[in-house]
Interface confidence: medium
């Protein structure tokens, strides 16, 4: 006869491990008992359980409620046992010793491997600002047994580097993603991908990149000279910029207060029916937490009654 078993039994933390031990013998042979033991390099051989043909299943008190026989129907030649709710400390070598009559004893050893799936965490780096050099965008850490694989999935150009720390029963892997911040990266996803044999599918954690920037400011609205004549309605100046965080806008007049009737609505300056008093230098001030920008324009309102004058369009930043 011979024993049918496995060299390695792999189970995920918390699952039940089936330790296989089946005696394949002649029809007239009987299995008297199957003794299971944990083989520890330090503690030696320690009995786990014993299946006896007459007295039934005996379980070592250290494994009370954790060792069972597989559910029926059971073959009398099957000495397999279930180890419930596998923990990391269960990982190691096990021995199955089968006593048969009249053939004698057979034994086999197997290794139980307990996979500990990682629970990854993603930590964003310091605030990203356009103009910085190579900067940490995020780090991702995952600890498991065996060591997990940690990679990055992103369209953003950058560099990744990994380091790992080995503990007695697990390994922690940390991967960092560095980049040179630019405004085009704003809102782009940066995904940490963790692979591990104990996971049915990769674990993914996505971080949305936020890059602080403030674009140069410019003013639109002076393109059509015909709008800037005395009596015209609906004339506006619009301040153009963009930024992250979104900027705030402030309008002032360089050569005095804003004329009465001029309305400020965010980035837009709205004028009442134009008069020559609306001529002047207007300044748009754009700011966010990162920086501030100014753009100024000179507005001259043309009086049609005075053909000698024409609209002077000057823009300076």
């Amino acid at each position: 006869g011979e024993l049918e078993t496995s060299d390695v039994v792999t189970v995920v933390l918390g699952q039940d491990a089936k330790l296989p031990c089946f005696y394949r013998g002649d029809p007239d042979e009987q299995v008297g008992q199957v003794a299971w033991a944990r083989v520890d390099p330090n503690e030696g051989i320690r009995e786990l359980a014993l299946l006896h043909s007459k007295y039934g299943l005996h379980v070592n008190p250290a494994y009370e409620d954790r060792v069972e026989q597989p559910p029926p129907p059971r073959d009398p030649l099957d000495g397999s046992v279930l180890l419930r709710n596998a923990v990391q400390a269960d990982e190691g070598e096990y021995e199955c010793r089968v006593s048969t009559f009249p053939a004698g004893s057979f034994q086999a050893r197997m290794r139980l491997r307990v996979l500990v799936p990682p629970l990854p965490s993603l930590n964003p780096g310091p605030p990203l600002e356009e103009g910085q050099g190579l900067t940490l965008a995020a780090s991702c850490t995952a600890e498991g047994s065996p060591a997990p694989s940690v990679t990055w999935d992103t369209e953003v150009k950058g560099t990744q580097s990994s380091r790992s720390f080995t503990h007695p029963r697990s390994a922690a892997v940390t991967s960092e993603f560095h980049l040179v911040p630019s405004r085009s990266m704003n809102g782009q996803p940066l995904t940490c991908v963790v692979s591990h044999p104990g996971l049915l599918q990769d674990r993914r954690i996505t971080h949305t990149l936020q890059v602080a920037f403030l674009a140069e400011a410019s003013v639109r609205g002076l393109e059509d000279q015909n709008l800037w004549q005395v009596g015209r309605e609906g004339a506006t100046l619009k301040c153009l910029s963009e930024g992250q965080p979104p900027p705030k806008y402030n309008w002032t007049r360089l050569d005095g207060p804003l004329p009465s009737g001029v309305r400020v609505k965010g980035d837009t300056l709205g004028f009442p029916p134009l008069t020559t008093e609306h001529s002047g230098v207007y300044v748009c001030h754009v700011s966010n937490e990162l920086s501030s920008r100014d753009s100024q324009v000179t507005v001259e309102v043309l009086d049609p009654e005075d053909p000698g004058k024409q609209v002077d369009l000057v823009s300076a930043s």
Epitope: Q33, A37, E47, A49, L50, H52, H58, N60, P61
Partner: nanobody, 118 residues
Framework: EVQLVESGGGLVQAGGSLRLSCAAS????????MGWYRQAPGKQREYVAT???????NYADSVRGRFTISRDNAENTVYLQMDSLKPEDTAVYYC????????????WGRGTQVTVSS
Amino acid sequence: EVQLVESGGGLVQAGGSLRLSCAASRSTFSLNIMGWYRQAPGKQREYVATITSGGSTNYADSVRGRFTISRDNAENTVYLQMDSLKPEDTAVYYCTAELVRRGPTTYWGRGTQVTVSS
């Protein structure tokens, strides 16, 4: 040949405790399984509990949680701690041991009387 000698039986009130001992005439390391059966008057011999040389245990459902089996291989002795005794535990308690060579050989003691009064 292995001789098994039980002791510790006696009369006890319901809810009380007793500890039975069974001494073997040879090293219990070579005795694969040791344990206890009991036989009440007019009934068949009934399995109580067994323990392996490695300390693994098994109990009949009727005594699980109340009785504890243990063994001291150095002293060649097996014990049965009986707590929360009931009148229906009244019986002669027999020590048993199995020796595995070419086939299993089972040995029995002469028994010790346990009486639980209500």
